[in-house]
Each structure stands twice: as structure tokens, then as C-alpha cells.
């Protein structure tokens, strides 16, 4: 902490401007009014303060707002956000998507920090659910965001938000997460026609049950092998050779290259050899 010292004559700050970069830490503490700083936070980012000087400015805001900063200040924190601890952020009440975007912008291009994770958690909990606009914003900054949520957290995602999800947003999701997301996607896309529906639902099929895969096999969808390989093992096992052939269409030949890998291996092992032979791929059960 900076010692309390009187501000030298003529140095009292009347506005937040570039002259302050020449102030020593103790001078900033003594000569910058916290209330002035709070009202002119938007100017701080335009001034090349040192990290030590930013520490002083943060300390002044902490003193002014011991219960947590108001959103009017939070929205303009800019690089000062990087000085905040998760404990600081837990005191905030962030409700504006613009505020969230402004702070995510500061951390752009970096891994999700504990500060950002705490900020997002506070924001989403404040909203009560992960709505489409929020999801759009978060996945734009962090494509892996959705898959960083627990199945319990994902259960608060309304089906309408699923429209914001891009295939790459699901790349790192595990089976338990897809189990939660798939029914939501099925509901979100239920009014689409066959081919359009398949394009949209494809990325979520790792959570699909057997009966849905059987239904898809009747629709000439021509599922690619990459999608098939992500299906739930327990959903694939009951499929007949004929159903898998219909499901994959021309891609069925790809089974040969994947015969040693799950879930293809598990499925092959449980088929009658006579049925496998009808594929003409030389698969051995």
C-alpha cells in the first residue's frame, strides 16, 4: 500500500490526462481523487501508465468501492481489468453485454484467465441462463467456451441459444456434454426439413440415442465417417448392418479404415459375419 502523504502544491489532478504518467506512485495516491478517477475511467486506457501506477489507481477504486465497483466503472476498466483478482470480480454485478464485451476485448487472443472465467460466471449467473446473444459473444472470443462448461451448467442453455453454436464450438466437448446439448439441438432444429436439419444437427450427434440414428438412416443423410466416429458407442451397437449402410451411404467404405477404432470396432464385433460380408469390405467380426 502507498503511504498517505499530502499532495504537493499545484499537483492536484483536475482531470485524468497524460501529465499523470510523470507522477510518482505516492503522488498519484495523494493527488488523484478517487471519485474523479471513477468518472473518467474511459481516459485511463489512452494513457501509458506503468503497471505500478495502475496498481495505485486500482487501490483508489478499491477504497472508493469496497463492496465492488459499479457497472459504470467496470465498463471502462480496460487494461485495469488485468489487475483485478477473481475475488475482486466476485463482488461485481455485471448485467450489460457491452460491459462483458469490453472486458473480453482486453483479454483477446489470450487463454481464458481465472479473471475472465469468474467474470463470465458472474455474468451468466446474473442473467439466469446462457442466452443466444451471450453465447454468440462468448464463443466469438473463446471457441472452446461451451465445452468448458460442466453438464450441469450446460443444462441452463435454452434451446433457442443453440442457433448460435458453430461446429467448431463443439470440437472439445466430451460425450457427457453432448448428451446434454443434443436434446436441446433437436428441439431447436425440429421444424427444419430433412437435409437442412441434418446439416444443423450433425455436430451434436455425439449425444444422439439409437432411435434417432435409426430414424436418420431412413433419410438418405450420407453421414461422413468423422461424424460416425463421434457417435455414442451404446447408440451405435444396436444398429444393424443395413442401417449403418443407409446411414453412411457412399461413406460406408470408410468403415474399413476405421475397423480397429471405436466405436466401429465395437459395432463390428457384435454383428453376424454373414451380415458384414454383404458390405463387401472384408470386415471381420
Amino acid at each position: 500500500e502507498v503511504e498517505k502523504t499530502a499532495c504537493p502544491s499545484g499537483k492536484k489532478a483536475r482531470e485524468i490526462d497524460e501529465s499523470l504518467i510523470f507522477y510518482k506512485k505516492w503522488e498519484l495516491e495523494a493527488c488523484v481523487d478517487a471519485a474523479l478517477l471513477a468518472t473518467q475511467m474511459d481516459r485511463v486506457n489512452a494513457i501509458p501508465f506503468t503497471y505500478e501506477q495502475l496498481d495505485v489507481l486500482k487501490h483508489k477504486l478499491d477504497e472508493l468501492y469496497p463492496q465492488g465497483y459499479p457497472e459504470s466503472v467496470i465498463q471502462h476498466l480496460g487494461y485495469l481489468f488485468l489487475k483485478m483478482s477473481p475475488e475482486d470480480i466476485r463482488k461485481w454485478n455485471v448485467t450489460s453485454l457491452e460491459t462483458l464485451k469490453a472486458l473480453l476485448e482486453v483479454n483477446k487472443g489470450h487463454e481464458m484467465s481465472p479473471q475472465v472465467a469468474t467474470l463470465i460466471d458472474r455474468f451468466v449467473k446474473g442473467r439466469g441462463q446462457l442466452d443466444k446473444d451471450t453465447l454468440d459473444t462468448l464463443t466469438a472470443f473463446y471457441p472452446g467456451y461451451l465445452c468448458s462448461l460442466s453438464p450441469e451448467e450446460l443444462s441452463s442453455v435454452p434451446p433457442s441459444s443453440i442457433w448460435a453454436v458453430r461446429p467448431q464450438d463443439l470440437d472439445t466437448c466430451d460425450p457427457r456434454q453432448l448428451d446434454v446439448l443434443y436434446p436441446k439441438a433437436r428441439l431447436a432444429f425440429q421444424n427444419m426439413n430433412g437435409s437442412e436439419y441434418f446439416v444443423k444437427i450433425q455436430s451434436f450427434l455425439g449425444g444422439a440415442p439409437t432411435e434417432d440414428l435409426k430414424a436418420l438412416s431412413q433419410q438418405n443423410v450420407s453421414m461422413d465417417l468423422a461424424t460416425f466416429m463421434k457417435l455414442r458407442t451404446d447408440a451405435v451397437l444396436p444398429l444393424t448392418v443395413a442401417e449403418v449402410q443407409k446411414l453412411l451411404g457412399p461413406h460406408v467404405e470408410g468403415l474399413k479404415a476405421e475397423e480397429r477404432h471405436r466405436p466401429v470396432r465395437d459395432w463390428i464385433l457384435r454383428q453376424r459375419q454373414d451380415d458384414l460380408d454383404t458390405l463387401g469390405l472384408g470386415l471381420q467380426g
Epitope: D174, R176, T233, D234, L237, R260, H261, R262, L269, G285
Partner: antibody, heavy 119, light 107 residues
Framework: QVQLQESGPGLVKPSETLSLTCTVS??????????WSWIRQPPGKGLEWIGY???????NYNPSLKSRVTISVDTSKNQFSLKLSSVTAADTAVYYC???????????WGQGTMVTVSS | DIQMTQSPSSLSASVGDRVTITCRAS??????LNWYQQKPGKAPKLLIY???SLQSGVPSRFSGSGSGTDFTLTISSLQPEDFATYYC?????????FGGGTKVEIK
């Protein structure tokens, strides 16, 4: 509750064949969802998968042991067996049988049996 | 064969510590990754399957994460009974392979 029990000689001479049997109790070796594996662990070392069998008789072996391994299943006795030929001292290990449940992993193990290869 | 590399090979920790063990596959194995715990003279015990699913009866302080090639086993608060050796194992390829093991010892 499925239980597995390994049985077989604890001492085998070099160049001979190691033979072990695993008896399945409380469940069926003919289960649709299960594969039956053999895994070994040399003293003070890590785990090495030897191979598995499905009740249909389909097998799959560790490539490094394939030329010497045979795993078979006897559904009438609810058992599966391991044969490892041309053994050397390097085959000295604790041998485990294990159930490989298709939706999880090796969820049930035998208690293991120590096999020493020595003349 | 798919190689599984575990790190560290051993670690010392105290009761209450958060412990993280990593496992890396030489190629993508999707989520087909299991974790086992083994105590001296005993058979291994399945802790986590499919990368992140907790096996029935296993305490919730154990958790797993990851997909593709990089996986993590975390013990949120180490208990006296958790001092053991931990192994990862891939079941994606038909030739199953285990990691070399991580021995968790008392500091």
C-alpha cells in the same frame, strides 16, 4: 456382482508355455457388452495389455506378443484362458484377467496371479 | 501402436493438496481414455472412463478432463487413501495401451 479368479501354475520353465485360466462368477462370459482381457505387470513395472476375447471367439492381441499368445473362451464353463508360448524371464509378472465393459473400461479385475519363469 | 505418455512419473504431495496428472496420446483418441488407481499388491481400480465420467463408487474429488490427445486426472483434495500409482489407458485403438504410471507419494 461379477467376480474374476485367475488360476494356473506359478512357476514355468523357460521356452515352455504359460497357461492360465480365468473363471467368471456372478455373471456370464457370453455377455453382449463385455470383452475379456488379460493384462500383466512385471515386478516394479507398469501395466501391459496382452489381449482380449469376445464370447463369439473373436480375439485381438498386443502386436508385440501376438506371435506367442492364444486366448480362448469356454462358454460352457464360464471361463477364458491365456496361453503364452516360448516364455523367457522377461515374461515373469503378475497376470490379471479383467472385464472390459464396452461403455467404460476394465471395471472388474481378478486379484492377479504371480507367474515366475525360471529353470 | 498409440503411445501414452504420463507426467510426472512421480510426485510428492500433502493431504489436502490439489493434484494434477497429465496423459498425452501420440495421436487423437477422441474421449476413449480411462484412469486407474493401483495400490501395492492390489489389482488396479477403474476411476474415470471416457475421459471424464466418474466410475460408480469413486469419490467425487476425482475428476477427469480432455479429449483428442491431452488428458488430465485431478484429485481436488488429496486424502491419505489416495497415495498410490495412477495409470491412464486408451481404448480407442484395438491395441490397448497404458501410460507408464504416476506414483503419488506423501511429502
Amino acid at each position: 456382482q461379477v467376480q474374476l479368479q485367475e488360476s494356473g501354475p506359478g512357476l514355468v520353465k523357460p521356452s515352455e508355455t504359460l497357461s492360465l485360466t480365468c473363471t467368471v462368477s456372478g455373471g456370464s462370459v457370453s455377455s453382449y457388452h463385455d470383452l475379456w482381457s488379460w493384462i500383466r505387470q512385471p515386478p516394479g513395472k507398469g501395466l501391459e495389455w496382452i489381449g482380449y476375447i469376445y464370447y463369439s471367439g473373436s480375439t485381438n492381441y498386443n502386436p508385440s506378443l501376438k506371435s506367442r499368445v492364444t486366448i480362448s473362451v469356454d462358454t460352457s464353463k464360464n471361463q477364458f484362458s491365456l496361453k503364452l508360448s516360448s516364455v523367457t524371464a522377461a515374461d515373469t509378472a503378475v497376470y490379471y484377467c479383467a472385464r472390459d465393459f464396452v461403455l467404460s473400461g476394465f471395471d472388474i479385475w481378478g486379484q492377479g496371479t504371480m507367474v515366475t519363469v525360471s529353470s | 501402436d498409440i503411445q501414452m505418455t504420463q507426467s510426472p512419473s512421480s510426485l510428492s504431495a500433502s493431504v489436502g493438496d490439489r493434484v494434477t496428472i497429465t496423459c498425452r496420446a501420440s495421436q487423437s483418441i477422441s474421449s476413449y481414455l480411462n484412469w486407474y488407481q493401483q495400490k501395492p499388491g492390489k489389482a488396479p481400480k477403474l476411476l474415470i472412463y471416457a475421459a471424464s465420467s466418474l466410475q460408480s463408487g469413486v469419490p467425487s474429488r476425482f475428476s477427469g478432463s480432455g479429449s483428442g490427445t491431452d488428458f488430465t486426472l485431478t484429485i481436488s483434495s488429496l486424502q491419505p487413501e489416495d497415495f498410490a500409482t495412477y495409470y491412464c489407458q486408451q481404448s480407442y485403438d484395438a491395441s490397448y495401451t497404458f501410460g507408464g504410471g504416476t506414483k503419488v507419494e506423501i511429502k
